[in-house]
Interface confidence: low
């Protein structure tokens, strides 16, 4: 999907007023260097882009995010303010449905969102590099 | 240990300058966002500038806007205040601040300086 | 700008809880974090992000925001705690950050 079209202001004040807090709240009880920057992204969009990635998509030693308080926003958010973007979702919902939920927060899931966290700081910046 | 170690604070006439320094160790320097804090005699705290871990941007509080100048170099660990046509009203203590930008989702400062005074009067 | 305002002294006796509010437009939707300073001395984080504690600070320290407040709580108030306590916010729409007027904890 291309983020390009989105309504960056508007997707900025759903993660100031809400997203940003339920990320904290996931990483509550983790200190907050105990991770390394790894995921980094360059404009809104690609930011959009990698959030998007690292927050619906399975990865090795952290099998779902999406049922997480902040990735259900998040999709919303994507949902509300990107053209599109919830008609290219409908296959991903449906596997999503397939997927157990997470009983215990691993910390592969928590390095994880400490990476959302930081994409979305960059994302929020309203002065990005090549934007 | 870690630390952040300010220089460079001084007397000085109005409208002149001066440049204050803020060196970094003990801690990956060029991972966090770097500000520069003042505390006028008896007064509060105020906010002065930031400059991004990679140096990419910059922000200045207001009353320094246009007259101040913070910049980084990142392979010495060091932070700076570049300060020009001081007024009456800039005399402070001014503290260096780190912020664990990637981490924490607005600036919280977790590492002061100790400060340096800068008195600014003719 | 955005503006923090803080109560600019509060007493109490020790043992006792103190609490120290900071007052901003919807500030329930922004992060708060708080400092101590003593005399002398350079500020030091107490609570960040409204309510998380840094490991070198004593549980007695809490923190929490909603509506248009946020409280720093002290509980078991000793004589160690006297010092002037900064709220502080980074406001998005300017891109500054923004401090409280500073609150100054006597304990009796």
């Known amino acids: 999907y291309d983020f390009t079209n989105c309504d960056f202001e508007k997707i900025k004040a759903a993660y100031l007023s809400t997203i940003s807090k339920d990320l904290i709240t996931y990483m509550s009880g983790t200190k907050s260097t105990e991770f390394n920057n790894t995921v980094s992204c360059s404009n809104r969009p690609h930011c959009l882009t990698e959030i998007q990635s690292l927050t619906f998509n399975p990865t090795a030693g952290c099998a779902s995010l999406a049922k997480e308080m902040f990735a259900m926003k998040t999709k919303a958010a994507l949902a509300i303010w990107c053209p599109g973007y919830s008609e290219t979702q409908i296959n991903a919902t449906q596997a999503m449905k397939k997927r157990r939920k997470r009983k215990v927060t691993t910390n592969k899931c928590l390095e994880q969102v400490s990476q959302l966290q930081g994409l979305w700081r960059r994302f929020n910046r309203p002065l990005l590099k090549q934007q | 240990q870690m630390q952040l170690v300010e220089s460079g604070g001084g007397v000085v006439q109005p409208g002149r300058s001066l440049r204050l320094s803020c060196a970094a160790s003990?801690?990956?320097?060029?991972?966090?966002?770097m500000h520069w804090v003042r505390q006028a005699p008896g007064k509060g705290l105020e906010w002065v500038a930031v400059?991004?871990?990679?140096?990419?941007?910059?922000h200045y509080a207001d009353s320094v806007k246009g007259r101040f100048t913070i910049t980084r170099d990142n392979s010495k660990n060091t932070l700076n205040l570049q300060m020009n046509s001081l007024r009456a009203e800039d005399t402070a203590v001014y503290y260096c601040?780190?912020?664990?930008?990637?981490?924490?989702?607005?600036?919280?400062?977790?590492?002061w300086g100790q400060g340096t005074m800068v008195t600014v009067s003719s | 700008s955005y503006v923090l305002t803080q109560p600019p002294s509060v007493s109490v006796a020790p043992g006792q809880t103190a609490r120290i509010t900071c007052g901003g437009n919807?500030?329930?939707?922004?992060?708060v974090h708080w400092y101590q300073q003593k005399p002398g001395q350079a500020p030091v984080l107490v609570v960040y992000?409204?309510?998380d504690r840094p490991s070198r600070i004593p549980e007695r320290f809490s923190g929490s925001n909603s509506g248009n407040t946020a409280t720093l709580t002290i509980s078991r108030v000793e004589a160690g705690d006297e010092a002037d306590y900064y709220c502080?916010?980074?406001?998005?729409?300017?891109?500054?950050?923004?401090f409280g007027g500073g609150t100054k904890l006597t304990v009796l």
């Open positions: 601040a780190r912020a664990p930008q990637w981490y924490l989702s607005a600036e919280a400062f977790d590492l």
């Open positions: 003990g801690f990956a320097f060029r991972t966090y966002g």
């Open positions: 400059i991004w871990d990679d140096g990419s941007n910059t």
């Open positions: 919807l500030i329930g939707s922004k992060l």
């Open positions: 992000d409204d309510s």
């Open positions: 502080q916010v980074w406001d998005h729409s300017s891109d500054h950050v923004v």
